[in-house]
């Protein structure tokens, strides 16, 4: 009798030990994971995060679609709606250069760096060549008339525009439009001005920054968060809190991301900080990630979202701050009337697009999203989509703008910058992070389950045997 009872008790004890061990392993395992993650996401020499941060292992592509104007004469002569036809994608490989001037500052636990710019055309991923021609707004004419509203200056500009045979629209190659060309009208300006114009001029051989970000050594919750940009904590483009540099650069976020979080990040392309909210769970190459999207609320007018009041910087074009979906970034572009929006004026008010025909906004194609691995905070896949527009206004003094009867926010191009973790990197990530965590979770569950089952089973058997013996 004793042998059997002792065996049952031993089994119950082993079960209890296994269950306790499994239970203990949960917080301990979590602690181990947190400890490992905290160690590996710090931005310092020797960590996984640092290696991938210095030079992204992911191939990043920037696709461009150009809005080819179909009726330039009609617009110029009759102030008709602008008919556009998007042509693209024209694809470039970007962000392939390693960060430069990386300097650790142990005093405040930050690391500073420059992000060099470079673009390599990818013919196999494009619909044409860099020599393809497009009819687009004359960037110099539109910008000059906005920068110099003084009528006398405009009369002077008009004589130079006429002399150079420039017009409201121009034909330019893709290479010229994106990376720069010498403008014939600006070449005649008698005082010193930059005569080169381009949507992204200058780009190659330039760098974005200096960025100074927290390396996470003192507090992991601050890792990758920007401390200063170009030596300042503010941008000097906006009023109040709109001017703040918030969050990271969106390449990564502090670890242990929760679905309830609002992820703040700064984008120098749009000259502002913005935010993303959780949308859905996504499985990316076997890695569970959280998809965060830029909500329409971020592009709303101050009437719809009072938080955006300080992004409304002028009253006329914005119809007294009631228009939405476009952001005037002229202060950040040396006064050039550049407006940023989502492609095809997605989430924009009808008055913005009523002067343009041929646009088809579509959430799936035109919104921006970030797929973030929640444990590490790494962005494993993203699609950054934005449209660059230029404001052109009627001018009584500039002949080629004289017949316009209204303001136009003219779409020039839209871009889709994408990056997805490669298959090899994903495999490595699965084995090193997801795999290990899943294995640990599995071991915890097995120990706990087996332990509880053993304990319960042996205890029931023991109780049953005892009651038999007593009888």
């Amino acid at each position: 009798g004793c042998d059997r009872n002792c065996g049952l008790i031993t089994g119950a004890v082993i079960g209890a030990v296994l269950a306790v061990f499994g239970g203990i392993l949960m917080p301990v395992g979590d602690m181990l994971i947190q400890k490992t993650i905290k160690k590996e996401v710090v931005l310092e020499e020797g960590t996984i995060a640092f290696k991938n941060w210095v030079k992204t292992g992911t191939e990043i592509y920037r696709q461009f679609w150009i809005f080819d104007v179909q009726n330039p004469q009609e617009v110029m002569m009759n102030s008709s709606n602008i008919q556009v036809k998007q042509r693209g994608p024209y694809t470039y490989r970007v962000r392939f250069l390693a960060k430069e001037n990386i300097t650790q500052d142990p005093k405040d636990n930050t690391v500073s760096f420059l992000q060099p710019n470079g673009a390599i055309f990818e013919p196999s991923l494009s619909v044409g060549t860099e020599a393809d021609n497009f009819t687009v707004l004359n960037l110099a004419v539109a910008a000059a008339s906005h920068i110099y509203p003084n009528p006398f200056v405009q009369v002077v500009l008009n004589s130079l525009i006429n002399k150079s045979k420039s017009s409201m629209f121009q034909v330019r190659t893709l290479r010229e439009l994106l990376w720069g060309y010498t403008d014939p009208f600006l070449s005649l300006v008698p005082y010193p001005v930059s005569t080169r114009v381009g949507m992204f001029y200058p780009y190659n051989n330039t760098a974005d920054g200096v960025y100074k970000v927290f390396n996470g050594k003192d507090s992991i919750s601050k890792v990758a968060i920007i401390d200063t940009y170009k030596g300042k904590r503010n941008l000097s483009y906006w009023e109040s809190y709109c001017d703040m540099i918030n969050g990271t650069d969106a390449a990564s976020f502090p670890p242990f991301v929760e679905k309830s979080q609002v992820l703040q990040f700064f984008s120098s392309d749009i000259c502002r900080s913005i935010y993303a909210v959780f949308e859905s769970d996504v499985n990316l190459k076997g890695i569970p990630v959280y998809r965060f999207v830029l909500p329409s609320k971020a592009f709303a007018s101050p009437v719809q979202n009072p938080d955006n009041h300080c992004f409304c910087t002028e009253k006329i074009i914005s119809k007294n701050c009631t228009s939405y979906g476009v952001l005037d970034i002229s202060k950040c572009k040396e006064g050039k009337p550049v407006y940023i929006s989502l492609p095809h004026f997605l989430y924009a008010s009808p008055d913005v697009s009523e002067t343009i025909d041929g646009l088809n906004p579509n959430e799936e194609e035109h919104r921006t999203y970030l797929d973030i691995e929640p444990i590490t905070g790494f962005t494993l896949q993203f699609a950054k989509r934005l449209q660059v527009n230029l404001l052109v206004k009627p001018s009584n003094k500039i002949q080629v703008l004289k017949r316009l009867k209204r303001n136009y926010i003219v779409p020039i191009l839209w871009l889709n910058e994408t990056g997805t973790i490669g298959d090899e990197k994903a495999k490595m990530f699965r084995s090193q992070v997801t795999g290990k965590i899943n294995l640990l979770g599995l071991i915890e569950m097995i120990l706990l389950s087996v332990g509880v089952v053993m304990f319960v089973a042996f205890m029931i058997s023991y109780c049953a045997c005892r009651s038999k013996t007593i009888k």
Epitope: N150, P151, F152, V153, V155, V156, S159, N396, K397, K402
Partner: antibody
């Protein structure tokens, strides 16, 4: 009150140069163009040129391109016109005129100096 | 260069009469015409600016019309204080050009 105060009359010899000043007050000098206009005795008005003080940009009537040079000193809110290689047909009243305005429509030459008489004589 | 032909060179009217001065330009200048009054011994004074806009403080008896190349300046009910030279100025293109002037006298 907007005022444009020009320097006094000048009597100069042929071939010489002269520099006329126009001191402004009552408005933001850099924001509005300053023009210079010539009026020969008993004749019509001729536009010499204009300068935009904000960036120093100038435009000249081709006829006066080699005759007049327009400059500004924004620290003293003063515009200047230098005339060189003077001849007898340069004898005239020279006016500075500002585009400072309020209200509708863009008005040219809204405020004028009192004029500076330049006499070229041997 | 846009040339401006102003007529008549001079005219003499009785007080209370209507005065009409005409300026014709050699190129189309839309409505970029301005009109000035110059009293003896004084600098010119802007009466009407581009777009036939009467300047603040200018009496409503002064008016103008025209578009393109043909412009007319009118004084209704002429007063003795209107004795002056009148000039038109085109401000459409460089160089700005004035008309030759019209001398108004009272009979």
């Amino acid at each position: 009150e907007v005022q444009l105060q020009q320097s006094g009359p000048e009597l100069v010899k042929p071939g010489a140069s002269v520099k006329i000043s126009c001191k402004t007050s009552g408005y933001t000098f850099t924001e509005y163009t300053m023009h210079w206009v010539k009026q020969s005795h008993g004749k019509s008005l001729e536009w010499i040129g204009g300068i935009y003080p904000y960036n120093g940009g100038t435009a000249y009537n081709q006829k006066f391109k080699n005759k007049a040079t327009l400059t500004v000193d924004i620290s003293s809110n003063t515009a200047y016109m230098a005339l060189r290689s003077l001849a007898s047909d340069d004898s005239a009243v020279y006016y500075c005129a500002s585009d400072y305005f309020y209200g509708d429509g863009y008005p040219w030459f809204t405020y004028w100096g009192q004029g500076t008489l330049v006499t070229v004589s041997a | 260069e846009t040339t401006v032909t102003q007529s008549p060179a001079s005219l003499s009217v009785a007080t209370g009469e209507k005065v009409t001065i005409r300026c014709i330009t050699s190129t189309d200048i839309d409505d970029d015409m301005n009109w000035y009054q110059q009293r003896p011994g004084e600098p010119p004074n802007l009466l009407i600016s581009e777009g036939n806009t009467l300047r603040p403080g200018v009496p409503s008896r002064f008016s103008s019309s025209g578009y393109g190349t043909d412009f007319v300046f009118t004084i209704e009910n002429t007063l003795s204080e209107d004795v002056a030279d009148y000039y038109c100025l085109q401000s459409d293109n460089l160089p700005f050009t004035f008309g030759s002037g019209t001398r108004l006298e009272i009979k």
